[in-house]
């Protein structure tokens, strides 16, 4: 069961696997998700009442019940891993902590004009977990305006105190803004020789290279193959560092893959997912559970579903026993990785996919905007599809959003009139309408599922989503957008952009080329005086210019209207009416998507 | 190569009904809508109506709602309209018509119906 | 029902002529028009679709232009083997629409 709110003056009893320390609860709670095993935590804030020695603790728990007794106590905030939950999980951290120093060991000392200066500055050294920040009210003189960079074994701090006129923060890198190299390649017959901060087993090179990637101080790693000679190291993955970050001497040997660590890659390549399976492969471990399965695939599903299962082993039925299943363990470890790689039993093996979400497709980073112009460029707006009827000719009908790998966002009005899904038509990656031919190829919708308390776009509810017959590879043109979350309900968006292949105005035609425009957000209390004969509800969103001039329009409906946040395009609205197009006090009405995010979830996930 | 083959021409009686057949070849015949079109002889096109075979679906002119009944069997790509209470007026050409990604592009050569006593 | 009006309902023209036919529709139907060619005893084809692109096989002397309500089919340079009847067609909306047809002679 997925429960995201913190309990306040709350401890959790037992279950102790480690104690960290973090700025926030909210902080916590991230470190205890990534956590291989973490379920649930203690945080202590700062608070007259407690030891200052145990503020800022994070006590990081497990618990085969997934529950553990809950005790009162002042200062203690608890809460649960969001490993339960099923919505896309971010390290990005961009929180700026005031007043707090937090501890590790200080390798770096510069000036920075800035805490955002010194913020940047971490993010592009490789070493960098977080920095502290004297700021120029800060009472040493030779101190003021000093960044410090720190680094430590867990990538969190040692410890944190309350220092005035600084500011604490972490690295951005996994917020996918770090300048560093990103180097994918993966070398063959070749040992890194410098020293090892850890090895865990692994069954290849790129689960090695995906476990260095989000190990805190692993910057490159060196990986022996089951066919490497010495026995003892067969599948043993090195994770390693230097003083310089990068490897200082690299010695040829057969049947050894080196790496680098993927930091600077994650926004573009899932360092948590490890999706394949390993035939011929057993994997040693705590048993969790054993449980009768007909396939790997589905003892794989059983591994996902089991929120401390990390990894399993299948092992075929013998023929005509138990019903054709076999034997499915679910295993776990202390650091998530098997204890042990056995090859030759005819065992097949995996991992969880529970961690995939930690790998959001929709973070990547995409073309640079062509600025100015309303014509788009190829590849500006992945998420945009066009959607097709075949009635009574084929033909643009509305624009859509891909928000999952088998699931566009659209809105419920383009479906009046529409009496099944299989006349319709999805293509994405698509620029021109033009290119769209008889043999393009495309996405046939298998469900419309339209809002049941939708009636008419004017009144709310204009949101649909549209199942695929088939699913979407993600590619640099047809790729998924990260849908708002519940908690930026207040953020300010700045940077929204309509787009979409409709009317440039009210009587015209639909536009070859996908057009865009910047668009100012505009406050309900506005919209609404500029709408007096509807009712404009929370559930909805307005953009539009005072003097007009740039709006959707006929065709747009259904597309996206989306909004760059901390470096991540949001779809933030989806276009479903308005007075006209582009009229001065005026503005597009938008279905505001935080608040059908529930909606969204639930049906999408339901299979 | 698409083809749209039709069944033959057919004489019949005032107030009985007609079946005429379109089979089709050479495209994924559930993919596309059939339309049924009507020409008197000497006159222009009228549309009946149209039925796109993977889902069922239709249309129909108003004037061929109550009289016109379009299938399709997929099993053998073959799409059928069926015309009840047959006047005199109903004696026309009907044609079965594809309508491709553009427009109505492969037409079958047409099923003759003359309504007689 | 969008109404398609054609004209003329019958013209005959010389080898070589420039030939005009016109269709006219009761509201927008943007650029969903299709024009067809009907030789005796045939079933129509295709000539003409988005009321301006020539379909696969058709002679480049066959051109349509037109949107909103007005089309236009020309043929620049009237041939022996284009003695047809001309339809004009709309699939903006059901049902679907023709003009009555426009009947070409070689005169």
């Known amino acids: 069961e997925c429960v995201t709110q913190l309990l306040k003056d709350t401890c959790f009893e037992g279950g102790d696997i480690t104690t960290v320390f973090t700025p926030s609860a909210k902080y916590c709670q991230v470190v205890c998700t990534y956590h291989p095993r973490c379920l649930l935590f203690t945080f202590t804030a700062e608070s007259p009442s407690e030891d200052p020695t145990r503020w800022f603790t994070c006590v990081l728990k497990d618990s085969v019940t997934e529950t553990l007794p809950r005790v009162n106590r002042t200062a203690a905030i608890s809460g649960y891993s969001f490993k339960q939950c099923s919505h896309q999980i971010s390290a990005c951290n961009k929180d700026i902590y005031v007043d707090l120093d937090m501890k590790g060991i200080n390798y770096n000392s510069s000036v920075a004009k800035s805490a955002q200066e010194c913020q940047e500055r971490c993010t592009d050294d490789v070493h960098c977990h977080f920095f502290t920040y004297a700021t120029r009210q800060f009472p040493s003189l030779e101190h003021r305006n000093i960044c410090l960079l720190k680094h430590t074994q867990t990538g969190t701090p040692t410890r944190i105190t309350k220092l005035d006129k600084v500011v604490s923060g972490f690295s951005l890198k996994s917020c996918a803004l770090s300048n560093l190299a990103c180097i994918r390649d993966i070398f063959p017959n070749t040992v890194f020789a410098d020293s090892n901060i850890d090895s865990v087993m692994a069954p290849d090179a790129f689960v090695c290279g995906r476990i260095c990637t989000h190990h805190p101080g692993c910057l490159f790693f060196t990986f022996f193959s089951q066919e490497w000679p010495k026995e003892s190291q067969r599948n043993l993955c090195l994770l390693k560092t230097s003083e310089s970050g990068l490897p200082s001497t690299r010695i040829k040997k057969s049947k050894a893959l080196s790496g680098f660590s993927l930091q600077s890659c994650r926004h573009s390549i899932p360092v948590f997912c490890h999706s394949s399976f390993y035939h011929d492969t057993d994997f040693l471990g705590e048993e969790l559970d054993i449980v009768a399965a007909k396939s790997h695939e589905a003892c794989q599903k059983l591994c996902t579903n089991a929120v401390r299962c990390q990894f399993f082993t299948y092992t075929p039925a013998q023929a005509s026993c138990n019903e054709g299943k076999g034997k499915c363990y679910l295993k776990l470890s202390s650091n998530g990785s098997p204890t042990k790689i056995l090859h030759g039993r005819g065992g097949i093996s995996g991992y969880t996919l529970r961690l995939c979400k930690m790998d959001n497709e929709c973070t990547t980073k995409i073309k640079p905007r062509i600025v100015g112009g309303t014509a788009s460029v190829r590849g500006e707006w992945p998420w945009q599809v066009t959607l097709h009827t075949t009635s009574p000719t084929q033909r643009h009908l509305c624009g859509g959003s891909i928000i999952g790998n088998q699931w566009i966002l659209t809105a419920a009005h383009c479906f009046y009139g529409v009496e099944s899904p299989k006349i319709l038509r999805v293509y994405s990656g698509i620029l021109n309408q033009s290119e769209i031919k008889e043999d393009t190829s495309f996405f046939g919708v298998q469900e419309i599922i339209i809002h049941d308390q939708y009636k008419m776009a004017e009144s709310g509810y204009d949101i649909a989503l549209l199942k695929l017959e088939t699913t979407v590879n993600y590619t640099d043109s047809q790729r998924p957008i990260c849908l708002p979350s519940k908690g930026d309900r207040n953020v300010i968006y700045t940077d929204c952009w309509v787009t979409g292949w409709g009317y440039r105005k009210l009587r015209d035609k639909i536009q070859n080329t996908l057009q865009k425009a910047k668009i100012p957000l505009v406050t309900n209390e506005e919209c609404q005086k500029r709408y007096r004969g509807h009712k404009i509800t929370h559930k909805m969103i307005c953009a539009g210019y005072r003097e007009g001039g740039k709006d959707a329009c006929k065709g747009d409906s259904g597309g996206p209207l989306s909004c760059k946040h901390n470096e991540v395009w949001h779809l933030v609205g989806i276009t479903s009416w308005g007075e006209g197009c582009a009229q001065r006090e005026r503005p597009g009405v938008y279905t505001n998507v935080v608040e059908y995010v529930d909606w969204i979830l639930e049906k999408t996930q339901a299979v | 190569q698409v083809q749209l083959v039709q069944s033959g021409s057919e004489l019949k009686k005032p107030g009985a009904s007609v079946k005429l057949s379109c089979k089709a070849s050479?495209?994924?015949?559930?993919?596309?809508?059939m339309h049924w079109v009507k020409q008197a002889h000497g006159q222009g096109l009228e549309w009946i109506g149209n039925?796109?075979?993977?889902?069922?679906?239709?249309n129909y002119d108003e004037k061929f709602r109550t009289r016109a009944t379009l299938t399709a069997d997929t099993s053998t790509s073959t799409a059928y309209m069926h015309l009840s209470s047959l006047t005199s007026e109903d004696s026309a050409v009907y044609y079965c018509?594809?309508?491709?990604?553009?427009?109505?592009?492969?037409w079958g050569q047409g099923t003759s119906v003359t309504v007689s006593s | 029902d969008i109404v398609m009006t054609q004209s003329p309902s019958s013209l005959s023209a010389s080898v070589g002529d420039r030939v005009t036919i016109t269709c006219k529709a009761s509201?927008?139907?943007?650029?969903?028009v299709s024009w067809f060619q009907q030789k005796p005893g045939q079933a129509p084809k295709l000539l003409i679709y988005?009321?301006?692109n020539r379909y696969t096989g058709v002679p480049d002397r066959f051109s349509g232009s037109g949107s909103g309500t007005d089309f236009t089919l020309t043929i620049s340079s009237l041939q022996a083997e284009d003695v047809a009847d001309y339809h004009c067609?709309?699939?903006?909306?059901?049902?679907?629409?023709f003009g009555q047809g426009t009947k070409l002679e070689i005169k």
């Open positions: 018509t594809r309508m491709g990604f553009y427009a109505m592009d492969y």
């Open positions: 050479g495209y994924t015949f559930t993919r596309y809508w």
């Open positions: 039925i796109y075979p993977d889902s069922d679906s239709t």
């Open positions: 509201e927008n139907v943007v650029t969903y």
């Open positions: 988005g009321a301006s």
């Open positions: 067609g709309q699939s903006y909306s059901y049902p679907l629409t």
